[in-house]
Interface confidence: low
């Protein structure tokens, strides 16, 4: 019968020829006048046999990306009568893989969009490589993946590129962030190829800013002819969230008097003091009123944001008017 | 099972050469590298290059660059040390190891090694 | 000099635990597997650890390695008299492109 060994010959070697093994009928002890042919495609052209011994040699360089076996079959003949010693038989010869491809990364570019000061363990986004390498051979298609840019407020599951926030981030500090990943192949051990990808990474805005009143004191007038519903001033406060959540709405905190109102321009984002009743010089000249501010949207889960509202203090001063007919009797 | 069966001592003079044989057995010889290693007396090992019995490709430590020259036959399953200017340092025990099929795995199995003693 | 730096001997007990110690650098532990091998007098070089903690079939498990950044360390415990013997770290260097013997370790067991 034929005796051989499995077959294998690694891809991309450099060499001229390459012993693949060797075919032979256990009838061959050497001194037979035994002939040895090899038949089936790549035979003559990627492989060889030497006829006298039947030993194989590749002689091309073999890519197992393209090709990853050949399917081959073999005769000997016994050239004292010419008749086949073994029944033809087919044999394979596998290419065995190198690492000659390097990860590349799928669906790129990558972007993503999480909430601002989201915890430790968010997931972010999963980046997925993929090498083109054999996955059943050794771990030239196995990659580990690794944070080159991003750190400290990113890491990568090494296996599963799954991208995870690792640390807390204030969008009004910074809103967007560039993680540059690496894929390296071999498990990442010596010898291994890598391929790297960028992803970009948008804070979105959470409400965890309160407004705050630009100024601590306002000072306002009216004149005391003013009918009520007039406005007579504004005030205005800043909120470093973005959107809805900087959406404010201005009210009166303290007004002993209850003589005015605020009202919230939603488009300008003031805070406009109106005359809810009409002043009069001669009875009080000046007037002190609180006004807070608060978000107009505020989650319950965000409410530790917002404890204490600001506030400011403004000061009215009323405008004297002379009165027609006025005088002593 | 795995031999690497090494040639026996020699003596030479300096600025000869040595050609050590390592014969290969219990393993298909063209599937893992050859290193050699050598040991000076009561010194510890020193690596001196490493050939792929398949293509025939070598490497050698820079120290032994132009000195060394690795060899096989594929015929006898052999692999070939060859040192060429010898001087007295080069006194020391040579062994041939099988490596992995990458050159950072360990060397698994060693030769017994040969004295290669140089004096004048 | 070795690239590798253990200590030149280590003495112990039967019965005792004692670490053998290799430093390296980047270029060779900091990158690469670290191998360990025993040598007992007048013998060839044994593979002992390789892959930095794997024991080959027929090492007692009271051998152990340990890898951590561009150090590593062999332990014995258990120590018995025949582990008295050379013991050195070897491990692949990228920047010489070669491999990387540590100087030895004399193990001295005493009785």
């Known amino acids: 019968g034929w005796v051989w060994n499995q077959f294998f010959v690694p891809e991309e070697m450099n060499t001229t020829s390459h012993h693949v093994g060797r075919l032979r009928s256990d009838l061959d002890n050497g001194n037979n006048s035994f002939q040895y042919k090899l038949l089936g495609a790549g035979a003559g052209s990627t492989f060889i046999i030497d006829e006298r011994t039947g030993d194989i040699y590749a002689i091309e360089k073999l890519d197992r990306e393209e090709r990853s076996l050949y399917i081959l079959r073999a005769q000997v003949i016994d050239i004292t009568t010419g008749r086949a010693v073994e029944p033809e038989s087919e044999f394979v010869i596998k290419v065995s893989d190198i690492n000659d491809n390097e990860p590349k990364f799928l669906d790129e570019p990558y972007e993503a969009i999480v909430p601002e000061m989201s915890p430790e363990g968010t997931l972010v986004i999963q980046v997925t490589a993929s090498d083109a390498d054999d996955p059943s051979s050794g771990n030239n298609a196995r990659l580990l993946y690794s944070l080159l840019q991003g750190q400290p407020y990113f890491s990568v599951e090494p296996t599963t590129g799954v991208i995870r926030i690792s640390s807390k981030m204030d969008r009004e500090l910074q809103d967007e962030y560039w993680v540059i990943i690496q894929a390296k192949d071999m498990i990442g051990q010596p010898g291994a190829l890598s391929g790297t990808t960028s992803v970009l990474i948008k804070l979105s805005d959470v409400n965890d800013n309160k407004p705050i009143f630009k100024e601590s004191l306002y000072r306002l007038t009216v004149s005391e002819s003013a009918p009520t519903g007039t406005s007579i001033g504004t005030i205005m406060a800043y909120d470093n969230d973005i959107g809805e959540n900087a959406e404010m709405d201005y009210s009166i905190e303290e007004d002993d008097s209850q003589t005015f109102d605020i009202i919230t321009n939603h488009e300008t984002q003031e805070g406009i003091v109106i005359l809810k009743k009409k002043v009069n010089f001669e009875h009080q000249n000046h007037y002190g009123i609180r006004a807070k501010v608060k978000n107009h949207h505020v989650d319950e889960q965000l409410m530790k944001y917002h404890t204490e509202a600001s506030t400011t203090f403004i000061k009215i001063q009323v405008e004297d008017v002379d009165e027609p007919g006025g005088g002593g009797s | 099972q795995v031999q690497l069966v090494q040639s026996g001592a020699e003596v030479k003079k300096p600025g000869a050469s040595v050609k050590v044989s390592c014969k290969v057995s219990?393993?298909?010889?063209?599937?893992?590298?050859i290193h050699w290693v050598r040991q000076a007396p009561g010194q510890g090992l020193e690596w001196m290059g490493i050939?792929?019995?398949?293509?025939?490709?070598?490497s050698y430590a820079q120290k032994f660059q132009g000195r060394v020259t690795m060899t096989r036959d594929t015929s006898t399953s052999t692999v070939f040390m060859e040192l060429s200017s010898l001087r007295s340092e080069d006194t020391a025990v040579y062994y041939c190891?099988?490596?992995?099929?990458?050159?950072?795995?360990?060397?698994?199995?060693w030769g017994q090694g040969t004295l290669v003693t140089v004096s004048s | 000099q070795s690239a590798l730096t253990q200590p030149p001997s280590v003495t112990g007990t039967p019965g005792q635990r004692v670490t053998i110690s290799c430093s390296g650098s980047?270029?060779?532990?900091?990158?690469?597997?670290v191998n360990w091998y025993q040598q007992l007098p007048g013998t060839a070089p044994k593979v002992l650890i390789y892959?930095?903690?794997q024991r080959p079939s027929g090492v007692p498990d009271r051998f152990s390695g340990s890898k951590s950044g561009t150090s590593a360390s062999l332990a014995i415990s258990g120590l018995q008299s025949e582990d008295e013997a050379d013991y050195y770290c070897?491990?692949?260097?990228?920047?010489?492109?070669?491999?990387?013997f540590g100087g030895g370790t004399k193990l001295t067991v005493l009785s």
């Open positions: 190891a099988r490596g992995g099929i990458q050159l950072w795995l360990h060397l698994d199995y």
């Open positions: 219990g393993y298909t010889f063209t599937s893992y590298f």
């Open positions: 050939i792929n019995p398949i293509s025939v490709s070598t």
């Open positions: 980047r270029s060779n532990i900091g990158s690469n597997f």
């Open positions: 892959t930095n903690n």
């Open positions: 070897a491990t692949w260097d990228e920047s010489m492109q070669g491999w990387v």
